[in-house]
């Protein structure tokens, strides 16, 4: 809290300009009118105020707008945004994508702070859904943004927005998130031809069910091992040796290096050793010849 002191003669600010740069805290408090500041917020960013000075300017705006800043002020906050708390931001009503972009630009280089997370939350809630333009903007600034959302939040992403997603945007997504995103991606890319479709759908395949993997195995897609290793274990287990061979194409040789890791390890345990031997990779651990495989889960379902 800055003490209330009278503004020295001749120091009253008539506009927000560089003459304020060496004003002390108390001089800024006493000599800068909050309404003037609000109307000339766009000038603040052109003046390298210290953090101490920015604190005073924020205090003046807080006094002028106790219920939250109007968007005309928010759009021009510039570096003052870094001084805002999540509590401040929860009072805002941000509807313009330009405002969002302006504030994210200020935060560039920083991790996604609680302030930014609150801002995005307010913006998305105000829009009702995560539309393509918003998603485009958010993933450009924060590639991991999509994977920071809960499956429930992801369910509000329209399939059309999936076109904005790049492979790196999904790097940190877990299987639950990909379970939600995969059907949307499948819908979004459904009109593409085989090879183009696979390029687009590839990074979402961690959410694909067995039947879709079987279908892909018929299309000569040559899935790489990195993608295969991210598939759901429960989706891989029912695949036959022949289907995995078709799915991976020339990359099938990579299975040997991954035979101790999931889902390859678990898949090997479900295959007949005879079938595994046909790959000629020396994969071990399959079901020995002459053993009967009972699918208990199928039996339970029937009963």
């Amino acid at each position: 809290e800055v003490e209330k002191t009278a503004c020295p003669s001749g120091k009253k600010a008539r506009e927000i300009d560089e003459s304020l740069i060496f004003y002390k805290k108390w001089e800024l408090e006493a000599c800068v009118d909050a309404a003037l500041l609000a109307t000339q917020m766009d000038r603040v960013n052109a003046i390298p105020f210290t953090y101490e000075q920015l604190d005073v300017l924020k205090h003046k705006l807080d006094e002028l707008y106790p219920q939250g800043y109007p968007e005309s002020v928010i759009q021009h906050l510039g570096y003052l945004f870094l001084k805002m708390s999540p509590e401040d931001i929860r009072k805002w009503n941000v509807t313009s994508l330009e405002t969002l972009k302006a504030l994210l630009e200020v935060n560039k280089g920083h991790e996604m702070s609680p302030q930014v997370a609150t801002l995005i939350d307010r913006f998305v809630k105000g829009r009702g859904q995560l539309d393509k333009d918003t998603l485009d903007t958010l993933t450009a600034f924060y590639p991991g943004y999509l994977c920071s959302l809960s499956p429930e939040e992801l369910s509000s992403v329209p399939p059309s927005s999936i076109w904005a997603v790049r492979p790196q945007d999904l790097d940190t997504c877990d299987p639950r998130q990909l379970d939600v995103l995969y059907p949307k991606a499948r819908l979004a890319f459904q009109n593409m031809n085989g090879s183009e479709y696979f390029v687009k759908i590839q990074s979402f395949l961690g959410g694909a069910p067995t039947e879709d993997l079987k279908a892909l195995s018929q299309q000569n897609v040559s899935m790489d091992l990195a993608t295969f290793m991210k598939l759901r274990t429960d989706a891989v287990l029912p695949l036959t040796v022949a289907e995995v061979q078709k799915l991976l194409g020339p990359h099938v040789e990579g299975l040997k290096a991954e035979e101790r890791h999931r889902p390859v390890r678990d898949w090997i345990l479900r295959q007949r050793q005879d079938d595994l031997d046909t790959l000629g990779l020396g994969l071990q651990g399959g079901i020995p010849n002459g053993y009967l495989v009972l699918d208990l889960s199928m039996q339970e379902a029937l009963s």
Epitope: E18, I21, A46, P48, T50, Y51, G78, Y79
Partner: antibody
Framework: QVQLVESGGGLVKPGGSLRLSCAAS????????MSWIRQAPGKGLEWVSY????????YYADSVKGRFTISRDNAKNSLYLQMNSLRAEDTAVYYC???????????WGRGTLVTVSS | IQLTQSPSSLSASVGDRVTITCRAS??????LAWYQQKPGKAPKLLIY???SLESGVPSRFSGSGSGTDFTLTISSLQPEDFATYYC?????????FGGGTKVEIK
């Protein structure tokens, strides 16, 4: 290419004068506040002087106040430091550096050496 | 505001984790920058706002702290990292620098 290049340094006797220049290129010079920062041999960095983007607001460290004058010519993308009444303790490498929206120095020149000695 | 860096110099080997501290004489929020200076070269901005990495700076550099105590960490020292490091506060004018920490080869 974004850069700052200082010139004008040299050997001068105590009480003498020198004018340093800093040529900016590759960015909108007139948007930036500019500074002179010096580094005495084997010592740390000292902020010497500061000028606003238009040139109307100026700061000097107490150690140079009344002896040094900072100025700029935005049309020529140039910054200057007129140094008068030089003392042995002014011996240093002088760097020009730029500031945009927050007062840290995002771009520095390579420096020019000023030696004050009889 | 005075900034005190410690240590003033240190010896380390390639691959080492190196930590440099900067202490402010009063609270400065997160208004701290770190610079690297190699002999005969201009200082180069590494980190601003205490922890934000300047564009193009390798991710092995990181900054932390707020208030009065700040740290610059180099997670795995590389040959090109042997240099002198300075902190600078921008919480209030006049802007001030720390005395520097020289990182030398062991």
């Amino acid at each position: 290419q974004v850069q700052l290049v200082e010139s004008g340094g040299g050997l001068v006797k105590p009480g003498g004068s020198l004018r340093l220049s800093c040529a900016a290129s590759g960015f909108t010079f007139s948007d930036y506040y500019m500074s002179w920062i010096r580094q005495a041999p084997g010592k740390g960095l000292e902020w010497v002087s500061y000028i606003s983007s238009s040139g109307s607001t100026i700061y000097y460290a107490d150690s140079v106040k009344g002896r040094f004058t900072i100025s700029r010519d935005n049309a020529k993308n140039s910054l200057y430091l007129q140094m008068n009444s030089l003392r042995a303790e002014d011996t240093a490498v002088y760097y020009c550096a730029s500031i945009l929206s927050v007062p840290y120095f995002d771009l520095w020149g390579r420096g020019t050496l000023v030696t004050v000695s009889s | 505001i005075q900034l005190t860096q410690s240590p003033s110099s240190l010896s380390a080997s390639v691959g080492d984790r190196v930590t440099i501290t900067c202490r402010a004489s009063q609270g400065i929020s997160s208004a701290l920058a770190w610079y690297q200076q190699k002999p005969g070269k201009a200082p180069k901005l590494l980190i601003y706002d205490a922890s934000s990495l300047e564009s193009g700076v390798p991710s092995r550099f990181s900054g932390s702290g707020s208030g009065t105590d700040f740290t610059l960490t180099i997670s795995s020292l590389q040959p090109e990292d042997f240099a002198t490091y300075y902190c600078q506060q921008f919480n209030s004018y006049p802007l001030t620098f720390g005395g520097g920490t020289k990182v030398e080869i062991k």
